[in-house]
């Protein structure tokens, strides 16, 4: 059962001091969705018992496993049903506390009634303030039964519920006709799903025989122990003032558990702590009584004394619940109350016993839940005990349940029951998930949903190339971490499977389903270098590069050119999609900008090493284009160009540049400088006869300006082929004429 306790502080003289605390002993309880499960919830349940609205109650979380409800302002705030919900997933459990007003007309003799299926439950409401009118019983808020006020027996109204079934469970109330619901007696009826001493589907399994008022859970056969007791059968008392499944919690305050009501998961319900009784749990047990609600009687023999918290304290030489067993009677020693094994394992179980006469191997036997008796295969005899070792046949799920070690000698016999949990090794329900991939490694998330039982102790990842018959490679990893599979082959499919293990021998589960994960292309390894670059304008740059010569095919799909503008913090990337390319024209750059330039080879999505960077300064943007450019053929080898100066110049022109290109020609254009910027005319000489040329020009101040319009003109015919065009300005021409 889930280790969950709801504590109610019953100091009722002052409602403002009243509080409810829910304590969970579960690992990771209450930490919320960022840990193992949902948080603890503690709330008033107004579905059945509705009380007048008041100020909202205050919820305070104390650490990860405790939550407290305060802020009750008046006694009526306390009346009704409170619930605490804790545990995760299928273990999510609700613990319920029912609070009665001490000033009600009717009071319950006992609030919580736990009964077995088929039993007769009797709810008893004691008359506290008499009214001569009908008493109405309700079940979960709906009409159930009516009693005439004359039907009271010894000042009590009884509701008999014969042959109860689990659906009969719930909140019952007894109210006088015309009285406030807050004056009702409220009860909680818990009906176990099985008859007395039975549990499991079909109620075929036998309960372990819970001691000290523990109640056998009808689903899992575990004993839900009263507060202050622990062990598989609640056989062990906690120290005074302690509670919880392992006695790990301590009652608050100097008076220990006095004045506290403890509510535990069904089918236990609520009671006072061990050693206390009364409607407010403030009365110590009467002599000879002990345990929760002082319901147990000591009946100590052989000089044992009764302790109201733990029961009989035996003198030397005696043991047993009532000190009825002589130490000469054999006794099972230090038997674990719970053992866990994995399915299909063949564990060894040890059982030690002492006594006089001394137990021997044949006097100790082990009984399985199905009644099969195992005899020990060997025994270790020591001066103070005999330890019998049992080799258990291969375990099946049906072996889960209560086993019993029994020792019999002529001095008597003793037996100890213990719970065996057969766990199913975990099997992944899904394939692992690929997170990232490179050419020689895959990063994988291995932990997936699984069938079977946790916790997961180790995760093994098995992998090998797809369609390979070679042995699987295996890597063992921490369950909470991602795995990197290294030293793989590039561009290769790998079959990857997960195997999960839980603690203990035989905890390895079957392999999960395979998935195909493919490594990336190989990384390009060649480092290019920049051969050179030249500025083709204020916003254009032509770049060229080279690669080292290596044998074999080139590993690469193309090149990536990167220009970094440090001033503006901007990067420009240019993709050259041919691995054969060794030059590229970069356009649309920012004039007057200092760029850092590099180039790298890429393959698939992977980049090779970058070239050593170059630093390039683009000239600032130049002046506007010259206007009204005009060309006029003068001879078979000369053409005259005329133009007008650009408008709105930012400064004095340092020169003009003329571009000359044969129309339709494939060669590079020729640039000719006109170094006398005041001129508006020049003659281009050395041209070929009968040839059509294209001309355009631009001015330069600090940087080159925009190109003018392009003009076409043909030289005159019948000339010889010239060496090539040259330029002569008008001023020079005039000089020659003189």
């Amino acid at each position: 059962a889930v280790d969950l306790t709801l504590l109610a502080n019953l100091r009722l003289t002052d409602p403002q001091r009243f509080f409810l605390t829910c304590v969970s002993g579960e690992a990771g309880a209450g930490r919320g969705s960022d840990a193992w499960g949902p948080p603890l919830l503690l709330e008033k349940d107004d579905r059945i018992v509705r009380t007048p609205p008041g100020p909202p109650l205050r919820l305070a979380r104390n650490g990860s496993h405790q939550v407290t409800l305060r802020g009750f302002s008046k006694p009526s705030d306390l009346v009704g049903v409170f619930s605490c919900v804790g545990g995760a997933g299928a273990r999510r459990t609700r613990v319920i506390y029912v609070h009665n007003s001490p000033g009600a007309h009717l009071l319950p003799d006992k609030v919580t009634h736990t009964v077995n299926k088929g039993d007769t439950a009797v709810l008893s409401a004691r008359v506290h303030k008499e009214k001569q009118t009908d008493v109405i019983w309700k079940s979960n808020g709906s009409y159930f039964y009516t009693l005439d006020w004359h039907e009271a027996q010894d000042g009590r109204f009884l509701l008999q519920l014969p042959n109860v079934q689990p659906p009969s469970s719930g909140i019952y109330s007894a109210t006088y006709l015309e009285a406030s619901p807050l004056g009702s007696a409220f009860f909680r009826l818990i009906v176990r799903g099985c008859g007395a001493g039975r549990w499991g589907p079909g109620c075929t399994k036998e309960c372990p025989g819970c001691l000290h008022g523990g109640v056998c859970h009808d689903h899992d056969g575990e004993c839900v122990c009263p507060p202050g007791f622990t062990g598989t059968r609640c056989e062990q008392a906690c120290r005074e003032g302690r509670f919880g499944q392992s006695c790990q919690e301590q009652c608050p305050g100097i008076s220990g558990c006095r004045g506290l009501t403890f509510c535990l998961p069904d089918p236990y319900g609520c009671s006072c702590g061990s050693g206390w009784r009364g409607s407010q749990c403030q009365e110590a047990c009467a002599p000879g009584h002990f345990g929760a609600d002082c319901r147990l009687q000591c009946q100590c023999q052989n000089g044992g004394t009764c302790d109201r918290f733990s029961g009989c304290v035996c003198p030397s030489g005696w043991h047993g619940v009532h000190c009825e067993k002589s130490d000469r009677i054999p006794q099972i020693l230090n038997m674990a109350s719970e053992l866990e094994f994995n399915l299909e394992t063949m564990p060894r179980i040890n059982c030690a016993a002492a006594g006089n006469p001394f137990p021997v191997r044949g006097s100790i036997e082990l009984r399985k839940p199905d009644g099969t008796v195992l005899l020990s295969t060997k025994a270790i005899v020591e001066p103070e005990k005999t330890t019998a070792e049992f080799e258990v046949p291969r375990l099946v799920l049906a072996d889960s349940g209560f086993w019993e070690c029994r020792v019999s000698t002529s001095g008597g016999q003793d037996s100890r029951r213990f719970k065996v949990n057969v766990k199913v090794p975990p099997v992944p329900l899904a394939a692992p998930r690929l997170l990232t991939k490179q050419s020689r490694q895959l990063v994988v998330s291995p932990l997936v949903s699984f069938s079977g039982d946790g916790p997961i102790s180790t995760v093994r990842l098995h992998y090998r190339p797809q369609d390979s018959t070679m042995d699987w490679s295996t890597i063992v990893v921490d369950p909470s971490e991602n795995v990197t599979l290294m030293n793989l082959r590039p561009k290769t499919g790998y079959s990857v499977r997960v195997q999960l293990s839980r603690p203990g021998e035989g905890g390895e589960g079957a392999w999960g389903p395979p998935t195909l994960m493919t490594t990336d292309c190989p990384e390009p390894l060649l480092q290019p270098w920049l051969e050179g670059w030249h500025v083709e304008g204020t916003d254009r740059l032509r770049v060229s590069w080279s690669l080292p010569l290596v044998p074999g095919p080139l590993v690469g799909d193309g090149f990536l050119l990167r220009l970094w503008d440090g001033t503006r913090g901007q990067e420009r990337r240019e993709n050259v999609s041919s691995p054969q390319a060794r030059t590229a024209l970069l356009t649309g750059l920012t004039p007057g900008t200092h760029y850092q330039l590099d180039v790298q080879l890429y393959h698939c999505t992977l980049l090779g090493p970058a070239s050593p960077p170059a630093h390039v300064l683009l000239p600032p943007s130049g002046p506007p284009a010259p206007r009204h450019l005009h060309a006029q053929a003068l001879s078979d080898s000369e053409i005259q160009l005329t133009w007008k100066h650009p408008e709105a110049l930012p400064g004095p022109i340092s020169k003009y540049v003329v571009e000359v290109q044969v129309a339709g020609g494939a060669g590079d254009p020729l640039w000719i400088d006109v170094d006398r910027p005041e001129e508006t005319s020049t003659i281009i000489r050395g041209l070929n006869a009968s040839t059509r040329y294209l001309f355009r020009m631009r001015a330069s101040i600090q940087g080159l300006g925009d190109w003018s319009n392009t003009v076409e003109e043909s030289t005159l015919g019948n000339g010889l082929q010239a060496e090539g065009p040259v330029q002569e300005s008008r001023a020079a021409e005039e000089g020659l004429d003189q």
């Epitope: 009118t133 009908d134 109405i136 009409y143 159930f144 039964y145 009516t146 009693l147 005439d148 006020w149 004359h150 039907e151 006709l177 015309e178």
Partner: antibody
Framework: EVQLLESGGGLVQPGGSLRLSCAAS????????MAWVRQAPGKGLEWVSV????????YYADSVKGRFTISRDNSKNTLYLQMNSLRAEDTAVYYC???????????WGQGTLVTVSS | QSVLTQPASVSGSPGQSITISCTGT?????????VSWYQQHPGKAPKVMIY???NRPSGVSNRFSGSKSGNTASLTISGLLAEDEADYYC??????????LGTGTRVTVV
């Protein structure tokens, strides 16, 4: 569906006896108070008697006290009215009804006619 | 045990509202909030229309409403319909755990 079916009515001489039955179905009979209400021909309704679920408490109208006895058999889901020393003024249609807390009758039978005449 | 006093008859036109009174004592009507009203058509069994002074069972038209002041309870039928023509009886729980019924009122829709 809740159903109440009265039977046992008929003609009886003054001073005679008659036992009425009411068979209940469609609800947990043993949990409810049950009552008899009568209506003389052309007259109004008159409450006659009530019995508590356990049968441990019964109440009667003054007009029938000492002559009529209400009883129930929870194992048979049946309500009874034993009528002795009948008088002409007991002539009426007798209805059986289920009583809810606070004394209202939420389900009624169709009634059975008792005629007391010589 | 005395009966509760009701008017012998009340009439109204379709669409009108009518009110029927029911007078008792402090031991019945005045002492408890347990007054109920029943409708009875000729030859039929009674049917509960109002319980606990003013509560309507499911299936009963909201044209029927109940109230109480002192020792007198009232049933109001608003938007009178021809089908409302019937006998109406009040009933009360008493301090002696018994029941008392009214004299009955014939409602006529004119």
């Amino acid at each position: 569906e809740v159903q109440l079916l009265e039977s046992g009515g008929g003609l009886v001489q003054p001073g005679g006896s008659l036992r009425l039955s009411c068979a209940a179905s469609g609800f947990t009979f043993s949990h409810y108070k049950m009552a008899w209400v009568r209506q003389a021909p052309g007259k109004g309704l008159e409450w006659v008697s009530v019995i508590y679920p356990s049968g441990g408490a019964t109440y009667y109208a003054d007009s029938v006290k000492g002559r009529f006895t209400i009883s129930r058999d929870n194992s048979k889901n049946t309500l009874y009215l034993q009528m002795n020393s009948l008088r002409a003024e007991d002539t009426a249609v007798y209805y059986c009804a289920r009583a809810l807390p606070g004394g209202y009758f939420d389900y009624w039978g169709q009634g059975t006619l008792v005629t007391v005449s010589s | 045990q005395s009966v509760l006093t009701q008017p012998a008859s009340v009439s109204g036109s379709p669409g009108q509202s009518i009110t029927i009174s029911c007078t008792g004592t402090s031991s019945d009507v005045g002492g408890y909030n347990y007054v109920s009203w029943y409708q009875q058509h000729p030859g039929k069994a009674p049917k509960v229309m109002i319980y606990d002074v003013s509560n309507r069972p499911s299936g009963v038209s909201n044209r029927f409403s109940g109230s109480k002041s002192g020792n007198t309870a009232s049933l109001t039928i608003s938007g009178l319909l021809a089908e409302d023509e019937a006998d109406y009886y009040c009933s009360s729980y008493t301090s002696t755990a018994t029941y008392v019924l009214g004299t009955g009122t014939r409602v006529t829709v004119v």
